[in-house]
Amino acid sequence: IWELKKDVYVVELDWYPDAPGEMVVLTCDTPEEDGITWTLDQSSEVLGSGKTLTIQVKEFGDAGQYTCHKGGEVLSHSLLLLHKKEDGIWSTDILKDQKEPKNKTFLRCEAKNYSGRFTCWWLTTISTDLTFSVKSSRGSSDPQGVTCGAATLSAERVRGDNKEYEYSVECQEDSACPAAEESLPIEVMVDAVHKLKYENYTSSFFIRDIIKPDPPKNLQLKPLKNSRQVEVSWEYPDTWSTPHSYFSLTFCVQVQGKSKREKKDRVFTDKTSATVICRKNASISVRAQDRYYSSSWSEWASVPCS
Amino acid sequence: RAVPGGSSPAWTQCQQLSQKLCTLAWSAHPLVGHMDLREEGDEETTNDVPHIQCGDGCDPQGLRDNSQFCLQRIHQGLIFYEKLLGSDIFTGEPSLLPDSPVGQLHASLLGLSQLLQPEGHHWETQQIPSLSPSQPWQRLLLRFKILRSLQAFVAVAARVFAHGAATLSP
């Protein structure tokens, strides 16, 4: 058993049929010694008396808010949550496996640049009695500070018969060094509580591996005289790290016909312009990627050929 | 060339070679063999390799003030990785394919380190750590980890040389 926060405790249980459970001793936070009784949740049934209460925690029915009283007055509370371990593996019932980039991916994170700011998100089908708390650091043995905001509900989607809820959080490394080569990964820890179930999820990454630039901006076409060719130009996204002579991007320019089946023409360039042939009803798209490190491509920025 | 005394390197040549190194490091990575040994290792091999850190002067301001600190750190790293790529980790079982980009990568690391430091000048280099793989699967794991860490190192070096070529070239 360990303390999650003041008066909230997590009991770790091996979860299998007829498991013996864990013996837990609760102590009433009071100078009083006599006449103390204990109840669980809203029930008025007295579970025991005395300054301490010993219980055998085996299932969710044994978890909840234990209260000690004296003469009708509440002295203190202890909320017990359960953390299930099945066959040596902690349960992951609350969050949905996003399966990208690999199985058992519950948290996904992205950064728009090297400033040390990043966003993480996760999915669940649970709509009520759900709380999240997020902590982060750079490294784990001698952790350096990363400050995270509160997790917020950022999207709701209908998936078949189910509703899916997306939560996200923004974090910022306290003393980021954008030009350095990271040697210690960022660790993100999410505590999830649904009713009386506690779970924790972690992700470990380097900012360089979660970089996804915003799409290029100001995408423009300039027809070339007496030619089907056009000059496409664009600019670095505002959110990208500066100076651009140091934090350089590379670009992919694509000409795509109306039909998805039509052959795509692609050009790769380090410049912020390219010359391509504009076909009727086609569109021109440009996306960006770090020039020297193959993290994610940005989403496409597009303009119609016409 | 970056002479320890302080003359400028051939920024443009260094830029071209470091960008080639980036391409090679990424093309070598998936080709060292099939790999799903999860890299969730609690101990990182990369703790043992030289990193371009915050105080090494490799940021744009640091390069403007005095690029020598940064160039020395890059040189140290290039020599270190060149030695690793020539070690038993990459030459032992399982054998790399004859046309593996690791050979080109090895040669290019040496080429860039020589551009930075002509013969007769010596910057301090770091000892390569004893990672002591005894099994082929351990070598394979180390190859992946070393190449991942090399990708990060050469990305920073390439940024340095690109910025130097754009802003510090005579």
């Epitope: - | 063999g33 054998s95 005894s134 099994q135 699967w137």
Partner: antibody
Framework: EVTLKESGPVLVKPTETLTLTCTVS????????ISWIRQPPGKALEWLGV???????NYNSGIKSRLTISKDTSKSQVVLTMTNMDPVDTATYYC???????????????WGQGTTVTVSS | DIVMTQSPDSLAVSLGERATINCRAS??????????MHWFQQKPGQPPKLLIY???NLESGVPDRFSGSGSRTDFTLTISSLQAEDVAVYYC?????????FGGGTKVEIK
């Protein structure tokens, strides 16, 4: 289908040399390592040695001086030679494929049926 | 050599009940966070069969009532609900250092 089949003498006299052949199919010896493992009657398993994809070998130091493992990749055959046999070498000898280096980390994913060798005069 | 010690030597469990086998290595069998610990099942007259590789990965075709956990020196094989066909001897094996070594085996029977 991946198969490994051991063949060789059933009975060997003390001091003689044992030669066992492992013939494999369904994969190439240039892609997978092969180990030899033995199991005395009613006892646990003992690893004898391995021949790697590139032809290098490693042996159990306890019996290294008596062992040789070689292979002919084109014939899909691996040969175990063990000199100076003794009654304590009586065991079932298995030829075993080591799983893909990058996934299995030394786990042996396919085993032959084994051949029982008795050492007796 | 790395010595692998299995416990218990034998285990009698009722059908549908849980069986747990432990394996302790005399030194760590982890290499940069990868556990080179594997579990095999051997039925009478048959060669061993790989069940779990790298401590916790289920070999394809093996029922998911089998699971493995642990790291460094302490490992566990669990059969969550014993079936009649699970009666066998179970071995752990390390491949972190030469020579590869096996545990002495745990015989699982039905109570």
């Amino acid at each position: 289908e991946v198969t490994l089949k051991e063949s060789g003498p059933v009975l060997v006299k003390p001091t003689e040399t044992l030669t066992l052949t492992c013939t494999v199919s369904g994969f190439s010896l240039s892609s997978y390592a092969i180990s030899w493992i033995r199991q005395p009657p009613g006892k646990a398993l003992e690893w004898l040695g391995v021949i790697w994809t590139g032809g290098g070998t490693n042996y159990n130091s306890g019996i290294k001086s008596r062992l040789t493992i070689s292979k002919d990749t084109s014939k899909s055959q691996v040969v175990l030679t063990m000199t100076n046999m003794d009654p304590v070498d009586t065991a079932t000898y298995y030829c075993v494929r080591e799983g893909d280096y990058g996934s299995y980390a030394g786990a042996m994913d396919y085993w032959g049926q084994g051949t029982t060798v008795t050492v007796s005069s | 050599d790395i010595v692998m010690t299995q416990s218990p030597d034998s285990l009698a469990v009722s059908l549908g009940e849980r069986a747990t086998i432990n394996c302790r290595a005399s030194e760590s069998v982890d290499y940069y966070g990868i556990s080179s610990m594997h579990w095999f099942q051997q039925k009478p007259g048959q060669p061993p069969k790989l069940l779990i590789y790298r401590a916790s990965n289920l070999e394809s075709g093996v029922p998911d009532r089998f699971s493995g956990s642990g790291s460094r020196t302490d490992f566990t094989l669990t059969i969550s609900s014993l079936q009649a066909e699970d009666v066998a001897v179970y071995y752990c094996q390390q491949a972190n250092k030469d020579p590869y070594t096996f545990g002495g085996g745990t015989k699982v029977e039905i109570k």
